[in-house]
């Protein structure tokens, strides 16, 4: 997260870190007691490596009492996402049991509604993400606030020049913005998901390249079908 | 434990090129930026570039550009500085560093005929 | 580009001294690092982010500033403390650094 602070400690019981040999790869967002939803591309930089999801995190270093990590029984990328795409960028985590619940767990209510959040809301996004354009990753969750932007003017030609989708969304990126690591993680406006972080490689913070998340709301079927 | 390893001390010829290594352990260079940066003892410290491991972009300090260019191997988390048409001028201790929090031990380049 | 000037160049400390280094900017940049290089050693970081200490980093240092003007704080001084600090700015590219302080002992 570059240009934000850091989160009021278990604030976001929604939040994940999904791991690979222990250490943070990208953000994730508890959506049901056994289900965490990422980003697809997270995958592809796993590699043979030991996927894990880490719930009940503030600080990723830190002994904290409502921290656990969780295998991954079964991991369902979209069935559309590619690797030379942001297009369907979402993955289904299984857990390997359902989590224990408490106040610093619990899923995050995901918009089933397919309509566009009104350009201007402020919409919380959080990670563990890299804080600096020097590459600095944070030891404690941050977030930031993030204005919507209208798809017609992410599309311009000085911006994402038409490759942004029905299914997703844009946010503001003039210095505040999501970054490397913290892709897969939730977009939230008015305490509900709207977004997931996509994971491309996107140059952050830069006003002229706004930041793209998945909209939740155009695969809820999908979505459904999974965790069903 | 974060460590940068970096490749031995090179004495080259005027006009010649030369490719230092740094080889990461403790974390995954995908996962962040790494720099490169120069010492030497009438310029100081001054940053060469940095790339983004996972999809090779780098930025550069325009005085670096044609003169440095940074790589990566992921598969062997390892970075390269490879400096070209050297001088008198680039004789210099040579770091890598991770995010700009770690830094390597440093190789020194000679450069003299 | 953001040109850092670092004062005194030179300075010295006694034991216990409370020291002062200062770096300034020819224009407003938003965030400072700063390192301590011993002699023969790489350079570690010591404060990101203006104020923020590095990890392993003694408390006696703090970092301060804003726009134009920074400065590192040794509350007491150390022996071990005796080492040339650089300034580093991360709001324009290139990214520069100061020309350093050379800190001694007394």
């Known amino acids: 997260i570059l240009g934000g602070r850091e989160a009021e400690a278990h604030a976001r019981p929604y939040m994940a870190s999904v791991q690979v040999n222990g250490e943070h790869l990208c953000g994730g967002v508890l959506v049901a007691e056994q289900w965490v939803l990422s980003a697809a591309h997270c995958l592809e930089d796993a590699a043979d490596g030991k996927v894990q999801v880490l719930l009940g995190a503030h600080s990723l270093s830190q002994p904290e009492p409502s921290k656990r990590l969780y295998d991954v029984l079964r991991a369902v990328p979209h069935p559309d996402s590619r690797p030379d795409t942001i297009d369907h960028d979402l993955l289904l985590l299984q857990l390997s049991e359902k989590a224990t619940l408490g106040p610093a767990v619990r899923p995050l209510p995901w918009q089933r509604v397919d309509r566009d959040v009104e350009p201007g809301t402020l919409c919380d996004v959080a990670g563990w993400g890299i804080v600096s354009h020097a590459g600095r990753r944070p030891d404690r969750l941050q977030h930031v606030l993030l204005p919507v932007l209208d798809r017609a003017t992410c599309n311009r030609r000085t911006h994402h020049d038409g490759a942004i989708t029905q299914r997703m969304m844009c946010a503001e990126s003039n210095r505040r913005d999501s970054c490397k690591g913290d892709s897969g993680g939730p977009l939230v406006c008015g305490g509900v998901l709207e977004g997931v972080v996509t994971s491309g490689s996107r140059v952050c913070g830069n006003r002229k390249k706004p930041g793209i998340y998945t909209r939740v709301a155009s695969y809820a079927a999908w979505i459904d079908s999974v965790l069903a | 434990e974060v460590q940068l390893q970096q490749s031995g001390a090179e004495l080259v010829k005027p006009g010649a090129s030369v490719r230092l290594s740094c080889t990461a352990s403790?974390?995954?260079?995908?996962?962040?930026?790494m720099h490169w940066v120069s010492q030497r003892p009438e310029r100081g410290l001054e940053w060469i570039g940095k790339i983004d491991p996972a999809n090779g972009n780098t930025k550069y300090d325009p005085k670096f550009q044609g003169k440095a260019t940074i790589t990566a191997d992921t598969s062997s988390n390892t970075v390269y500085l490879q400096l070209s048409s050297l001088t008198s001028e680039d004789t210099a201790v040579y770091y890598c560093?991770?995010?700009?929090?770690?830094w390597g031990q440093g190789t020194s380049v000679t450069v003299s005929s | 580009q953001s040109v850092l000037t670092q004062s005194p160049a030179i300075m010295s400390a006694s034991p216990g001294e409370k020291v002062t280094m200062t770096c300034s900017a020819n224009s407003s940049v938003s965030d400072m690092y700063w390192y301590q290089q011993r002699p023969g050693s790489s350079p570690r970081l010591l404060i990101y982010d203006t104020s923020n200490l590095a990890s392993g980093v003694p408390v006696r240092f703090s970092g301060s500033g804003s726009g134009t003007s920074y400065s590192l704080t040794i509350s007491r001084m150390e022996a071990e403390d005796a080492a040339t600090y650089y300034c580093q700015q991360w709001s324009t590219y290139p990214w520069t650094f100061g020309g350093g302080t050379k800190l001694e002992i007394k």
């Open positions: 560093l991770n995010a700009m929090e770690y």
């Open positions: 403790g974390f995954n260079i995908k996962h962040t930026y």
